[in-house]
Amino acid sequence: KNLKSPQKVEVDIIDDNFILRWNRSDESVGNVTFSFDYQKTGMDNWIKLSGCQNITSTKCNFSSLKLNVYEEIKLRIRAEKENTSSWYEVDSFTPFRKAQIGPPEVHLEAEDKAIVIHISPGTKDSVMWALDGLSFTYSLVIWKNSSGVEERIENIYSRHKIYKLSPETTYCLKVKAALLTSWKIGVYSPVHCIKTTVENELPPPENIEVSVQNQNYVLKWDYTYANMTFQVQWLHAFLKRNPGNHLYKWKQIPDCENVKTTQCVFPQNVFQKGIYLLRVQASDGNNTSFWSEEIKFDTEIQAFLLPPVFNIRSLSDSFHIYIGAPKQSGNTPVIQDYPLIYEIIFWENTSNAERKIIEKKTDVTVPNLKPLTVYCVKARAHTMDEKLNKSSVFSDAVCEKTKPGNTSK
């Protein structure tokens, strides 16, 4: 009886794993083996595919074959018993084009209200992605184990920290890789779960802001308790994109080590031009907080995008606010070349209820105010340029009293 050729050959490539699967054409014939040959582009001869000779199952692995992953290859398969079937040729393919990104490796660290996720490619020193290793981005799905409500986070790098979580709570997540340059989306990792720790005695510092005063940067933050010491560290932002090493060498800002106030001042020349991450930690001598959320700090923008200066003309039921360019000794605000948008926050002095106005104009009316009432106003500038999505810090608050009831004109 003539043996039939195997059919429906599928080539699965995940990272550097090359797997072939096929269907037996005749289930009734026993003790059949299968063999593959391959042919490279521009070659006439066929070569035996090592790892896929005299296979008794309908699956084989040819990962050991050192192929140029960017070069097209062709495969053929036949069945063998006493005689052999005719060859069945598989459509030619380029391994790199066909390859899928495998599940990444994931390691988790827990804090009380945060989880640190370390992600690395599932195949170390992969041949398939050798030229693309630096281009991997990742996305993840995270959920509370108890609720199952999923949150998706896109475009993250090899280390990512998720904040604002609940203490003593189990969170689960899965991660997949993407190579956007090649339009490739990977396979999800297995689900990893971790429980956040008991709430720390000391919370991390919050609301970190950087401003410029003369030739110095002023770093301010909020903290719950008094009599604390703080330290501030910085890291080049680009290092977060470096997948190679899991050690981030955060550096101390010398003038911000063991400071006893919720601010520190350091010279602008501490930082060369660039984008940095800053973080702050609190200590009371016995206990240490976890690190604050990291803030991005761009020296180019920080030096120029200063909080707006404004004047207030008070009426009985409104304020007229006139916004001018910030005055800075020896520091021309270059950023004025960019269109700015102004965020104005105002509140009744005796209340915490803030209201917000966003305006492109430099003269703004704050309506619906009560007569003879003290209101406070602060403002900040935002760039409208998409590539340069930056904000200044808020100006200091200015408080004014509205006029008596008959002066609305």
């Epitope: 390691h107 988790l108 660290e109 827990a110 804090e111 009380d112 640190v116 370390h118 971790i194 720790t197 008991v198 720390n200 005695e201 190679g244 090493n245 899991h246 050690l247 981030y248 060498k249 550096k251 101390q252 016995n286 206990n287 240490t288 976890f290």
Partner: antibody
Framework: QVQLVQSGAEVKKPGASVKLSCKAS????????IHWVKQAPGQGLEWIGR????????KYAPKFQGRVTMTADTSISTAYMELSRLRSDDTVVYYC???????????WGQGTLVTVSS | DIQMTQSPSSLSTSVGDRVTITCKTS??????VAWYQQKPGKAPKPLIY???YRYSGVPSRFSGSGSGTDFTLTISSLQPEDFATYYC?????????FGPGTKVDIK
Amino acid sequence: QVQLVQSGAEVKKPGASVKLSCKASGFNIKDYYIHWVKQAPGQGLEWIGRIDPEDAETKYAPKFQGRVTMTADTSISTAYMELSRLRSDDTVVYYCGRYHGYWALDYWGQGTLVTVSS
Amino acid sequence: DIQMTQSPSSLSTSVGDRVTITCKTSQNVGTNVAWYQQKPGKAPKPLIYSTSYRYSGVPSRFSGSGSGTDFTLTISSLQPEDFATYYCHQYFSYPYTFGPGTKVDIK
């Protein structure tokens, strides 16, 4: 493969100084921190400090501050620890270790025994 | 400084036994705890990092768990080569510290 090879045993007199070396191979020393740990005979492990070989930034345990100096020569992939004003209770084994972020101290040297005796 | 305590300080046990060593820290260190095994005259050998991850080449009978201030090293079925001293180590904040050690010897 990754290796940390430490210098040989030393015998010193009280009040003297000793400089130990830790030669790294199989990795770029600039990408990691090198830590030093001491262990007295029959006792536990005690952290002395660490150096970032890339820029020579150091952190020392308060107990050793002022008496220990860590340096590195990246051109020969070697970290050093100098301990001054030696006392008899400095008769211990000193280990260097590679620190790799959340991987902690993932490789250790074989240790150097320093004996302080008059 | 963060203080670390380990219990028990020593234990006598037999091959095949399940062994649990606990480590307490004086403050919350997240999951920044590692475990090392040391035999006489040898350098410490890394077993577990980040509380629960085994270093490559470490047998699966070794496992770590815990977070915050309470950590555990478990050896599911003790083998002859496991008789040694075990140290926990916090690398959350400077100065880094080690536990005093737990000596596991033959009953």
